[in-house]
C-alpha cells in the first residue's frame, strides 16, 4: 500500500452552522487506519496561525493551538477508530465563522477536505398547533 | 438484529487451503472495518488480520504473514479470510468480529481443524 | 510489538464481592484499551471501550479506568452471571495484543 505519504486518502466534510453561545460540531470523516497511532487530526482555519486542535499518537496535542480556540476544542477521541475527526466547538463565537480545514493522515498518506463554519444566532422555529 | 455469522470452517490436512466466510446483516457493513481472531482449544484470543471498511489498509499477525489472505465484498456484505499453508498450530476457533469502538460485535465462530 | 499482562491469571471470589483485574501494556497506549468478556463455548462480548466506557447494555456494575500503560477492570459487585474469562486488548497499533485472560470461578 506504499510509502507513508505518497497517496492521498478521502477525507470528507460537511459544511455546517454553529449557534453563537452554545457548542457546536465541526464533521469530518475519512477511512480509519486499524493502526491508530499513526493517525494524526490536525483542524486549521483560514487566516489563522496555529492550530484550532491536532490530535495525534492517541491523544490532544495541544502545543501549537491559537490562543482564540484555547479550552474550547475536543475531538471524538473513541470514534477515531470509525473514521470520526470531526471537532467539538466549545461557546461558540461570531468570529469562529470562516474556512475549516480538516488534515487527516495515516500510515497510507494523507489528505484534507474544506469546510465553511457559519456562526449566528440560529433558533428553531416555532410550531403553533 | 446485529448479526455475524461465519462459516467455511473443517478438518483439513497439514498443507492445506481453507476459505471462510462471515456474513454480515443489520448494519451498513461497508461503514465498518472488521477483524478476524482465533481461539486455540483451551488457549487465549489471537489477533490474525483485519481489513478497515473500504479495504484500504489490511493488517496480518506475523504468524500467518504470507499464508493467509483478509478480504471482503461490501456488495455482499461478507468478510473473507483465505488460508492456505495451513498448520497443526492454526488448529482453532475463528470468529470475525466488527471494528467499533471496540470488537462490539463478534460470530459465533468455525472451527478449524488442521490435521493428518 | 505491544505485550499485555494481566493479573491475577485466575481469581476465586463470591457473589456480592468487589473484584479488580488489572492489565499493563509494555508501552503507552493512550486510551485505546478494551475489556471483553467470555463463557465457555461462546464468543468474547465487548463490556468496556476506549478504557473506561461502557458498551450499551453492559451492567452498570462494570468499569474500567487508567490511561497509558496502567489498566484495571472493576465489578463492584458480583453476579451468578459474572462468573467467566476476562480479557484485556489494545488497538492503539497492530499487531493488536490481548492479554492472557483472567479466569474468575466461584469461591
Known amino acids: 500500500f506504499g510509502i507513508s505519504g505518497k497517496h492521498f486518502i478521502t477525507v470528507t466534510t460537511f459544511t455546517s452552522a454553529g449557534n453563537i453561545g452554545e457548542d457546536g460540531t465541526l464533521s469530518c470523516t475519512f477511512e480509519p487506519d486499524i493502526k491508530l497511532n499513526g493517525i494524526v487530526i490536525q483542524w486549521l482555519k483560514e487566516g489563522i496561525k496555529g492550530l484550532v486542535h491536532e490530535f495525534k499518537e492517541g491523544k490532544d496535542d495541544l502545543s501549537q493551538q491559537h490562543e482564540m480556540f484555547r479550552g474550547r476544542t475536543a475531538v471524538f477521541a473513541d470514534q477515531v477508530v470509525v473514521g470520526n475527526a470531526s471537532l467539538r466547538l466549545k461557546n461558540v463565537q461570531l468570529t469562529d465563522a470562516g474556512t475549516y480545514t480538516c488534515y487527516i493522515r495515516t500510515s497510507k498518506g494523507k489528505g484534507n477536505a474544506n469546510l465553511e463554519y457559519k456562526t449566528g444566532a440560529f433558533s428553531m422555529p416555532e410550531i403553533n398547533v | 438484529e446485529v448479526q455475524l455469522l461465519e462459516s467455511g470452517g473443517g478438518l483439513v490436512q497439514p498443507g492445506g487451503s481453507l476459505r471462510l466466510s462471515c456474513a454480515a446483516s443489520g448494519f451498513t457493513f461497508s461503514s465498518y472495518g472488521m477483524h478476524w481472531v482465533r481461539q486455540a482449544p483451551g488457549k487465549g484470543l489471537e489477533w490474525v488480520a483485519s481489513i478497515s471498511s473500504s479495504s484500504g489498509y489490511i493488517y496480518y499477525a506475523d504468524s500467518v504473514k504470507g499464508r493467509f489472505t483478509i478480504s471482503r465484498d461490501n456488495s455482499k456484505n461478507t468478510l473473507y479470510l483465505q488460508m492456505n499453508s495451513l498448520r497443526a498450530e492454526d488448529t482453532a476457533v475463528y470468529y470475525c468480529?466488527?471494528?467499533?469502538?471496540?470488537?462490539?460485535?463478534w460470530g459465533q465462530g468455525t472451527t478449524v481443524t488442521v490435521s493428518s | 510489538d505491544i505485550q499485555m499482562t494481566q493479573s491475577p491469571s485466575s481469581l476465586s471470589a463470591s457473589v456480592g464481592d468487589r473484584v479488580t483485574i488489572t492489565c499493563r501494556a509494555s508501552?503507552?497506549?493512550?486510551?485505546?484499551l478494551n475489556w471483553y468478556q467470555q463463557k465457555p463455548g461462546k464468543a468474547p462480548k465487548l463490556l468496556i471501550y476506549?478504557?473506561?466506557n461502557l458498551q450499551s447494555g453492559v451492567p452498570s456494575r462494570f468499569s474500567g479506568s487508567g490511561s497509558g500503560t496502567d489498566f484495571t477492570l472493576t465489578i463492584s459487585s458480583l453476579q451468578p452471571e459474572d462468573f467467566a474469562t476476562y480479557y484485556c486488548q489494545q488497538y492503539y497499533t497492530t499487531p493488536l495484543t490481548f492479554g492472557q485472560g483472567t479466569k474468575l470461578e466461584i469461591k
Open positions: 476506549a478504557a473506561s
Open positions: 508501552q503507552s497506549i493512550s486510551s485505546y
Open positions: 468480529a466488527r471494528a467499533s469502538s471496540g470488537m462490539d460485535v
